[in-house]
């Protein structure tokens, strides 16, 4: 069964820009990836980007760029005003949902401050599985 990982990284030189990296470990066919966040704007979940293997990517503010990093991982770059970034991100959780075949949906979430850039094999902070 594949495991989803999430990594959130702040840019060292630019506090208003950071990126969410996520992927699936193991052998599975990816049919859709959705990256979202919770607690950023309101209590609900905000969709940041959707990446389809064939039809490309779609993103919504504050996501600036979404792309595939490898055949089984994606990256979403977010940009916002510095003051808004500091105040909004404290309670924000980023989630990645991978729809894979034959395993169904796999979700992992991570908040900004639990991400350790030096971690070599991040374990998902939350791994919800819905087959």
């Amino acid at each position: 069964s594949p495991e989803v990982w999430v990594q959130v990284q702040m840019e060292a030189t630019n506090l208003s820009s950071f990126s969410v990296h996520c992927g699936v470990l193991g052998y599975s066919l990816i049919s859709l990836v959705t990256v979202s966040c919770e607690g950023f704007v309101d209590a609900g979940r905000t969709k940041l980007a959707v990446l389809h293997p064939e039809f490309g990517t779609q993103q919504w503010a504050p996501a600036r760029q979404a792309h595939w990093e490898t055949p089984n991982s994606v990256s979403v770059t977010l940009t916002m005003g510095q003051s808004k970034a500091r105040s909004s991100l404290a309670n924000t959780t980023f989630c990645c949902e991978f729809v894979t075949f034959p395993h169904g949906s796999r979700v992992a979430c991570r908040d900004l401050h639990r991400s350790d850039p030096g971690l070599s094999a991040p374990t998902p902070a939350l791994n919800l599985q819905a087959d």
């Epitope: 990982w5 990594q7 990284q9 990126s19 990296h21 992927g23 470990l25 052998y27 599975s28 066919l29 990816i30 293997p53 064939e54 490309g56 990517t57 792309h67 595939w68 990093e69 490898t70 055949p71 089984n72 991982s73 990256s75 850039p117 030096g118 971690l119 070599s120 094999a121 991040p122």
Partner: antibody
């Protein structure tokens, strides 16, 4: 133009480990995955696994799971592949290659490649 | 795992010949297929990516086609420098290479 330069040839004893390095120069290192591919003498190409330096996350081919560890050091733009519990069948040329792709779709390919590192396992 | 089967495993041809190499995937891989050329003692070199896109700097005599499970690499007019081994590679689920096709001088 990105170039990948690998460490030199190694001779190892069965049961030991080998660590091969792959240094990138002339381009962005962190945001591109680096894969490792091996080729036994007179044989075909075999993907072992790869790593995205910016996140430090590695993915491995099932065959090598548990025996190979791929790491990356962003500060030196270097990727490493360590293979443990070596046996004679691991005698091969080991290549690193950059996963290059379109980004907006899932099309990826290997370009460029390192020059290769010959690892000989012999008692 | 996705298995990639190349045929033939070797072939003999003359300069100027039209050469066709096929690659079959064990399941549909859409157009997630690449072709590489390798010469003895050298690293592989990318020729074709995404089934039919010619890599920059590669001569136009090389072309790729196919989607799903069946793919073809064609060399329209074989040149002396084309004698080498050719590999297909799928990039749909992780990566797998075909067994290779050695193109030799007749």
């Amino acid at each position: 133009q990105v170039q990948l330069v690998q460490s030199g040839a190694e001779v190892k004893k069965p049961g030991s480990s080998v660590k091969v390095s792959c240094k990138a120069s002339g381009g962005t290192f962190s945001s591109y995955a680096i894969s490792w591919v091996r080729q036994a003498p007179g044989q075909g190409l075999e993907w072992m696994g790869g790593i995205i330096p910016i996140s430090g996350t590695a993915n491995y081919a099932q065959k090598f799971q548990g025996r190979v560890t791929i790491t990356a050091d962003e500060s030196t733009s270097t990727a490493y592949m360590e293979l443990s519990s070596l046996r004679s069948e691991d005698t091969a040329v080991y290549y690193c290659a950059r996963d290059t792709g379109r980004g907006y779709t899932r099309h990826f390919w290997f370009d460029p490649w390192g020059q290769g590192t010959l690892v000989t396992v012999s008692s | 795992d996705i298995q990639m089967t190349q045929s033939p495993s070797s072939l003999s041809a003359s300069v100027g010949d039209r050469v066709t190499i096929t690659c079959r995937a064990s399941q549909s891989i859409s157009s997630y297929l690449n072709w590489y050329q390798q010469k003895p003692g050298k690293a592989p070199k990318l020729l074709i990516y995404a089934a039919s896109s010619l890599q920059s700097g590669v001569p136009s005599r090389f072309s790729g086609s196919g989607s799903g499970t069946d793919f073809t690499l064609t060399i329209s007019s074989l040149q002396p420098e084309d004698f080498a081994t050719y590999y297909c590679q799928q990039s749909d689920i992780l990566y797998t290479f075909g067994g290779g096709t050695k193109v030799e001088i007749k």
